[in-house]
Interface confidence: low
């Protein structure tokens, strides 16, 4: 029985619940359905308290305490992150009138870089209006329990380490978590604390196995050529330093005077043959990679490459 929320490489939602309220108090952002997936394969967290209030200045706001929980259809319980020092419960203290017609949203994406050297979390503020007015700090608290079975509940007080996330890029913060290579298979427990102008959001405890969150670098050396039998061969190289085999998703569009065709294929090789190509057409291609034999996160797409076939295709090519 573990009170932490398991992070998996797909979208999940974080809701901040005021006292004596139910989850029905919260709404998904406009246009977003409960099972929306992120097109780039990352999971995302949206922190979204919604409030109706009359116009009130920031200076005279009273504080309300919020528990931030991950929303799940099956289980509406959530664990609270024990404070790294004093052992007090991590709760979210937010100013309930600050959010006039604003949704407080964050996209949170974490992954282990493809060379297995660095675990990164990005916290992107979608709460633009407030963060323009206030400096904000983001901390990530984490612990790698020596043997998780010995302490299956929230880690004891004083066990957390804290890293200051680098928010030098406006509205996006980078948190670097030092995870030794020998512990990549272990369970990393972590939580986020976001502070802005006296407003504090703190996530519940999250758990992740870094090895299951590997995000490779994009494939390299994407190029195209016409084969002897008149097919289009798309080739690329695996990114360097990836210590396991990858699967690849290739997406391409064919644009000719008569037709526009789009397709994407999943392959385990580093090349793909496209048949029935048309003379005088342009092909725009991108490829991305993901761990083949286990869970993981798709890499970013490679830079698009465009290949234009000749008006006449010779067999064999001249």
């Amino acid at each position: 029985f573990n009170l932490s929320y398991p992070i998996t490489p797909w979208r999940f939602k974080l809701s901040c619940m005021p006292p004596n309220s139910t989850y029905d108090y919260f709404l998904l952002p406009a246009g977003l359905s409960k099972n929306t997936s992120n097109s780039n394969g990352h999971y995302e967290t949206a922190v979204e308290p919604k409030f109706n209030s009359s116009g009130t200045h920031f200076s005279n706001l009273s504080k309300t305490t919020f528990h931030c929980c991950f929303r799940s259809e099956q289980d509406r319980n959530c664990s609270l992150c024990a404070d790294n020092i004093e052992g007090k419960t991590f709760v979210s203290t937010v100013n309930s009138l600050v959010f006039q017609q604003i949704d407080a949203n964050w996209n949170i994406q974490c992954w282990l870089k493809g060379d297995l050297k660095l675990f990164i979390c990005y916290v992107e503020s979608l709460f633009k209006n407030l963060f323009r007015n206030y400096n904000y700090k983001v901390h990530l608290l984490y612990v790698l329990p020596e043997v998780l079975e010995d302490s299956p509940l929230v880690p004891q007080k004083g066990s957390f380490q804290m890293v200051h996330c680098n928010c030098s890029v406006h509205e996006c913060c980078e948190c670097l978590v030092p995870v030794p290579t020998a512990k990549l298979n272990d369970t990393l427990l972590m939580c986020l604390k976001i502070t802005s102008g006296g407003v504090i959001f703190q996530s519940p405890l999250m758990s992740v196995q870094p090895i299951n969150m590997v995000k490779p670098d994009p494939p390299l050396g994407l190029h195209m050529e016409i084969t002897d039998d008149g097919n289009l061969k798309i080739s690329w190289s695996s990114p360097p330093l990836v210590p396991f085999p990858l699967q690849y998703q290739v997406k391409y569009s064919e644009n000719s005077t008569t037709v526009i065709r789009e397709a994407d294929k999943i392959v385990s090789a580093t090349s793909l043959l496209v048949d029935s190509i048309l003379p005088g057409s342009s092909y725009e291609v991108q490829v991305r990679g993901k761990r083949l034999d286990g869970p993981g996160i798709w890499s970013d797409w490679s830079t698009p490459r465009v290949f234009t076939t000749q008006d006449v295709i010779y067999f064999p090519p001249k």
Partner: antibody, heavy 120, light 108 residues
């Protein structure tokens, strides 16, 4: 002028208690994280405790449970309550300000220090 | 905890010399490193923050560089008032905030 002035140091027996104070002037005290750092004679610097603008407190293992940091923003004052003092706690204690420059913290303003001697 | 190791622990130099002090972290700390100067009987003074940013009022002969685990403080041309003890300090993974053991810079 931005300034931090410590007081409250002195001679105390092992197991005794002492309360250090730090008065800030020349800046908006409640906007800054504040810390205590100590330096034993002829030795290096050791961080002792910190308190952020939210009132959350931070300690290293060597003093946790014995020292308590607090702040009184209305009085521009920082405090360090030291209980169960040990001979190894003998040091000059500095009060220091910790602003955030972007997201990089540093001790940019220090007090002159107050001497704490623990001896029987 | 992240350990900070400075080298050398002491060095002698002359006015006008170029001096380099190094600081190594036991694990990557990105660029969350600060440098301080302390003269006898005085409080430390912040020289460099975020590895390479010069604190306001600090002479430009002081510079910092490095990222990850290895960092350097350089004094391009030593002045008489620069003879002091220098400390590095990490603010990446806290608590605790940790300092190097110090480098004492003496007149040759």
């Amino acid at each position: 002028e931005v300034q931090l002035v410590e007081s409250g140091g002195g001679l105390v027996q092992p197991g005794g208690s002492l309360r250090l104070s730090c008065v800030a002037s020349g800046f908006t005290f409640n906007k800054y994280d504040m810390h205590w750092v100590r330096q034993t004679t002829g030795k290096g610097l050791e961080w002792v405790s910190g308190i952020d603008t939210d009132g959350d407190t931070y300690y290293p293992g060597s003093v946790k449970g014995r020292f308590t940091i607090s702040r009184e923003n209305a009085e521009n004052s920082l405090y360090l309550q030291m209980n169960g003092l040990r001979v190894g706690d003998t040091a000059v204690y500095y009060c220091a300000r910790w602003p955030w420059s972007g997201f990089y913290g540093a001790f940019d303003i220090w007090g002159q220090g107050t001497m704490v001697t623990v001896s029987s | 905890d992240i350990q900070m190791t400075q080298s050398p622990s002491s060095l002698s130099a002359s006015v006008g010399d170029r001096v380099t002090i190094t600081c190594r972290a036991s694990q990557s700390i990105s660029s969350y490193l600060n440098w301080y100067q302390q003269k006898p009987g005085k409080a430390p003074k912040l020289l460099i923050y975020a590895a390479s940013s010069l604190q306001s009022g600090v002479p430009s002969r002081f510079s910092g560089s490095g990222s990850g685990t290895d960092f350097t403080l350089t004094i391009s041309s030593l002045q008489p008032e620069d003879f002091a003890t220098y400390y590095c300090q990490q603010s990446y993974s806290t608590p605790p905030i940790t300092f190097g053991q110090g480098t004492r810079l003496e007149i040759k």
